[in-house]
Interface confidence: medium
């Protein structure tokens, strides 16, 4: 799917829009809010009843080059006694983000936007039990 | 994830860093993944730390619709279906990259923007501070 052109009638294309070759778009990768402060809860990945670990994937031809992925530690959830309860399930929570992919074709370099699915953490759910007839 | 070796005959051998401004293809790779979390899973209802999903829409952004999670309870749901305040529901947050139209309203000119979204909630053991 192409990025939708704004179809709303109240959006008039301003004269100040930069000229862009057909089939492509101009992208400034100087990130807005690059230095915003994240106020995440403390150590939730280890205190959760569905704890998870983090791994960092690194790719020099991707921007940003580092993407952090979470993996649930258990199939079940941790109960009040600190034991795994397999009557409940730890499941991943995922979120899409955009990255810019650099592609080399011979001497030329092209750039492509890509949607990446990031596993952010895990939550504990009641399983869906299918009763077989 | 390895850089493809460049032909030594190529002019201006590529810098390891990305340029500040790039021209990118309008087609997005992997674009057809499901963007509505209500359709993709029912974890938000089945979790012991359930959450509501709120639609955040901004036509100057791509994607224009982002779903924000808000934990329903301060505590977590126990085996009896009641809220247990000895445990806490907390949001799991993630920084994501989106496209912001820049200059505003321009159809094919964007800038990357980092935004913080709450993706879901998880149940944690609280850190209890005993006040002296």
């Amino acid at each position: 799917r192409k990025i939708p052109k704004v179809g709303h009638t109240f959006f008039q294309k301003p004269e100040s829009c930069p000229p862009v070759p057909g089939g492509s778009m101009k992208l400034d990768i100087g990130i807005i809010n690059e230095n915003q402060r994240v106020s995440m809860s403390r150590n939730i990945e280890s205190r959760s009843t569905s704890p998870w670990n983090y791994t960092v994937t690194w790719d020099p031809n991707r921007y940003p080059s580092e993407v952090v992925q979470a993996q649930c530690r258990n199939l079940g959830c941790i109960n009040a006694q600190g034991k795994e309860d397999i009557s409940m399930n730890s499941v991943p929570i995922q979120q899409e983000t955009l990255v810019v992919r650099r592609k080399h074709q011979g001497c030329s370099v092209s750039f492509q936007l890509e949607k990446v699915l990031v596993t952010v953490g895990c939550t504990c759910v009641t399983p869906v039990i299918h009763h077989v007839q | 994830g390895i850089t493809i070796p460049r032909n030594p005959g190529c002019p201006n051998s590529e810098d390891k860093n990305f340029p500040r401004t790039v021209m990118v293809n309008l087609n997005i790779h992997n674009r057809n993944t499901n963007t509505n979390p209500k359709r993709s899973s029912d974890y938000y209802n089945r979790s012991t730390s359930p959450w509501n999903l709120h639609r955040n829409e901004d036509p100057e952004r791509y994607p224009s619709v982002i779903w924000e999670a808000k934990c329903r309870h301060l505590g977590c749901i126990n085996a009896d279906g009641n809220v247990d305040y000895h445990m806490n529901s907390v949001p799991i947050q993630q920084e994501i990259l989106v496209l912001r139209r820049e200059p505003p309203h321009c159809p094919n000119s964007f800038r990357l923007e980092k935004i913080l979204v709450s993706v879901g909630c998880t149940c944690v053991t609280p850190i209890v501070h005993h006040v002296a």
């Epitope: 106020s39 403390r42 | 808000k70 309870h73 301060l74 907390v90 949001p91 709450s118 609280p126 850190i127």
Partner: nanobody, 123 residues
């Protein structure tokens, strides 16, 4: 980053009512658990209650459950405390507080606090 500013305090007669407001700045207000504490002269800071980010879940200190009502309006980035049947012992500085986690907030260890607003109950 969240900044909190309380308002609505003042002098009220015993048996009267008062509504305190807490205006929050910051785009992510709705992802925070927010609540109220109070501190009477010469006493420890006391937890009144808290409300979840969505507003669906409210937890009160048992002693104030019937007279105090906590609510929030995320569209206005505002937290409220409606107090009724006020008594002289309700005289205190009332503080608005916010944190990602109820556990921290409940035990007075929130990340963000307002400056407080004084409520005086006297005839």
């Amino acid at each position: 980053e969240v900044q909190l500013v309380e308002s609505g305090g003042g002098l009220v007669q015993p048996g009267g009512s008062l509504r305190l407001s807490c205006a929050a700045s910051g785009r992510t207000f709705s992802s925070y658990v927010v609540g109220w504490f109070r501190q009477a002269p010469g006493k420890e800071r006391e937890f009144i209650g808290a409300i979840s980010g969505s507003g669906d879940s409210i937890y009160y200190a048992v002693s104030e459950k019937d007279r105090f009502t906590i609510s929030r309006d995320n569209s206005k980035n505002t937290l409220y405390l409606q107090m009724s049947s006020l008594r002289p012992e309700d005289t205190a500085v009332y503080y608005c507080t916010a944190d990602q986690e109820f556990g921290y907030l409940r035990f007075g260890r929130s990340e963000y606090w307002g400056q407080g607003t004084l409520v005086t109950v006297s005839s």
